[in-house]
């Protein structure tokens, strides 16, 4: 028995930020779960993790340097990615594991979302910017 995941086929990040919503065929209310977002065809990079527990508040973290936040719905987790670089344009896959109460469940691999980062090239700002124009 597998959880099905729906994602938008493509999202464009115009300002180096994007909201990616992962919709599940499973209600996460009162479950202990680990939702994650993975980058690349081989899902090699774990971009962001949202860990939910019935007794604690949501934990959101990235171990790979991404600036991310997460929000929980009854049957969805939305990942908010900021400060994306143009070269991080790639396919991103939602993953979900429900641990407690049993049974352990995970998802069928989704089709993924291509995130096209079109925003400003994030460059360090100059030390002495010129005078601002009125």
């Amino acid at each position: 028995n597998k959880i099905l995941v729906k994602q938008s086929p493509m999202l464009v990040a115009y300002d180096n930020a994007v909201n990616l919503s992962c919709k599940y065929s499973y209600n996460l209310f009162s479950r202990e779960f680990r939702a994650s977002l993975h980058k690349g065809l081989d899902s090699a990079v774990e971009v962001c993790v949202v860990y939910g527990n019935y007794s604690q508040q949501l934990q959101v973290y990235s171990k790979t340097g991404f600036n991310c936040d997460g929000k929980l719905g009854n049957e969805s987790v939305t990942f908010y990615l900021q400060n994306l670089y143009v070269n991080q344009t790639d396919i991103y896959f939602c993953k979900i594991e429900v641990m407690y109460p049993p049974p352990y469940l995970d998802n069928e691999k989704s089709n993924g979302t291509i995130i096209h980062v079109k925003g400003k090239h994030l460059c360090p700002s100059p030390l002495f910017p010129g005078p601002s124009k009125p």
Epitope: E32, Y54, E97, M99, Y100, P101, P102, P103, Y104, D106
Partner: antibody
Framework: QVQLVQSGAEVKKPGSSVKVSCKAS??????????VAWIRQAPGQGLEWIGQ???????YYNPSLKSRVTITADKSTSTAYMELSSLRSEDTAVYYC???????????WGQGTLVTVSS | DIQLTQSPSSLSASVGDRVTITCRAS??????????LDWYQQKPGKAPKLLIY???SLESGVPSRFSGSGSGTDFTLTISSLQPEDFATYYC?????????FGQGTKVEIK
Amino acid sequence: QVQLVQSGAEVKKPGSSVKVSCKASGFSLSTGGVAVAWIRQAPGQGLEWIGQIYYSGSTYYNPSLKSRVTITADKSTSTAYMELSSLRSEDTAVYYCARSSAHYYFDVWGQGTLVTVSS
Amino acid sequence: DIQLTQSPSSLSASVGDRVTITCRASESVDFQGISFLDWYQQKPGKAPKLLIYDASSLESGVPSRFSGSGSGTDFTLTISSLQPEDFATYYCQQSYRSPITFGQGTKVEIK
């Protein structure tokens, strides 16, 4: 036949680490729903769940040991490992690996590995 | 953590006796009609052996004299007619909530 075979007994000094292996045969660590759990039993005491690794590679630990334990698996050799660091005398116990179902009952057990922590 | 309290801690019985061991959880271990409570038998120097899973399902190969019942917080393991090989320690275990926990054990000794 389905079985789990563990590595041999270990004697360790306080503050050191130990790594116990558990080789599965007759089933695959990659099979959906399967996890390998680690459980320990101090001399004359009851059973304590340490944590487990799921077929997906995700790990889950008992909060009481989380800072000191690492569970890994090598699917190519069907072997799971449990490493416990910063050992103290209270960690002296028999360490068991066990196959966990999706409902987390343990239907196949290893023979146990005695880890003795002594200065 | 969910605490499991077994009673009695030990008991003496004779071959042929009906033996009942109880396990009480500090909170319900039921979810969607399933009780996540299991029973194990352990003999000295050996690994535990699964007897009953999901409160009342008999593990394959386990003699039918073993049975489990209960729901919510109160569970029972019954051995209908004690056999010589049944003298051992019995543990209950919950997997409803992390961390998985075990009862302290009930030692069944020969009277």
